[in-house]
């Protein structure tokens, strides 16, 4: 059962991956990003269900083609470094999903934008925090 | 000093066209974004679109997204809003507003919406 | 869309009193520039709104330092030391850490 310090650990650790998250689509969604119409047209994958931890493994695999994307933001406006920020987000997602049960993601027929990504896993992440607190 | 004056507002019918001006002075109005937004009577501010500096890249609110059309003329100082499809909501004051600087390097400063016009009234009624 | 929502509503207040006005979000807007860009705004009856505050707490030129904005993250607030005659109307939280959105607006008139 967890305790209320591993109940405390999780929530700080979705703080920060909602935070990071948040972060990301700010720099992104904003008519100042000259990359924005060229952004929008990758797509992604969208998790069948979203609903506990373990269903963070749908975020892990994205990450990589995130990072891809995010690559094409860097300018003097977009401050993050793509590869730091996407490293900090997997170590967080591997800590909250766990590594103890392998977890095959089942993805939705219908691909995303990155914005429809980002704000997706932003309310994953505010569901839970709700149920932690 | 900073002026922005709009024109063109009026009563329109639904389903039919208006044109919407703001005149700019008093700054460099190439190296700025501009903006435009309304305020339907007794009711908030809602954005409405945005072009930036040398017109490449023009955003719209979904309410407008296909009937309304930002454009910009840096050779006259002046910012337009073509309205297609006029519908009844669409009833409003219309400003202009400044948006943010860009340097020569496509790098922005300084804070949107930091000066704004007087307005200009759209009705939209049968 | 980012929701920006103010309380209250409505302000009666007294001459030379304080006044606070809050606006919450519904997204973080810290951007990825570290900026956070919430500003607030001042529209008289009549005229069109004015900047008043802009990234939380940077006035904007010629606003008296009666005005004060502070906030972080989600949780903004913008304080009137002593309310004098001129500062009746509506005053608005936006943002633009992503594409614009205004808060509904709290009006503040003298009691």
């Known amino acids: 059962a967890p305790t209320s310090s591993s109940t405390k650990k999780t929530q700080l650790q979705l703080e920060h991956l909602l935070l990071d998250l948040q972060m990301i689509l700010n720099g992104i969604n904003n008519y100042k990003n000259p990359k924005l119409t060229r952004m929008l047209t990758f797509k992604f994958y969208m998790p069948k269900k979203a609903t506990e931890l373990k269903h963070l493994q749908c975020l892990e695999e994205e990450l990589k083609p995130l990072e891809e994307v995010l690559n094409l933001a860097q300018s003097k406006n977009f401050h993050l470094r793509p590869r730091d920020l996407i490293s900090n987000i997997n170590v967080i997602v591997l800590e909250l999903k766990g590594s103890e049960t392998t977890f095959m993601c089942e993805y939705a027929d219908e691909t995303a934008t990155i914005v429809e990504f980002l704000n997706r896993w932003i309310t994953f992440c505010q569901s839970i925090i709700s149920t932690l607190t | 000093q900073v002026q922005l004056v709009e024109s063109g507002g009026g009563v329109v019918q639904p389903g039919r066209s208006l044109r919407l001006s703001c005149a700019a002075s008093g700054f460099t109005f190439s190296t700025y974004a501009m903006h435009w937004v309304r305020q339907a009577p007794g009711k908030g501010l809602e954005w409405v679109a945005v072009i930036w500096y040398d017109g490449i890249n023009k955003y719209y609110a979904d309410s407008v997204k296909g009937r309304f059309t930002i454009s910009r003329d840096n050779s006259k100082n002046t910012l337009y809003l073509q309205m297609n499809s006029l519908r009844a909501e669409d009833t409003a004051v219309y400003y202009c507003?400044?948006?943010?600087?860009?340097?020569?390097?496509?790098?922005?400063?300084?804070?949107?919406?930091?000066?704004w016009g007087q307005g200009t009234l759209v009705t939209v009624s049968s | 869309d980012i929701v920006m929502t103010q309380t209250p509503l409505s302000s009666p207040v007294t001459l030379g009193q304080p006044a606070s006005i809050s606006c919450r979000s519904s997204h973080n807007l810290i951007h990825s520039d570290g900026n956070t860009y919430l500003s607030w705004l001042h529209q008289r009856p009549g005229q069109p709104p004015r900047l008043l505050i802009y990234k939380i707490s940077n006035r904007f030129s010629g606003v008296p330092d009666r005005f004060s904005g502070s906030g972080a993250g989600t949780d903004f607030t913008l304080k009137i030391s002593r309310v004098e005659a001129e500062d009746v109307g509506v005053y608005y939280c936006m943002q633009t850490s992503q594409f614009p959105t205004f808060g509904g607006g709290t009006k503040v008139e003298i009691k």
């Open positions: 507003a400044r948006g943010s600087y860009y340097d020569s390097s496509g790098y922005y400063y300084g804070e949107d919406f930091d000066y």
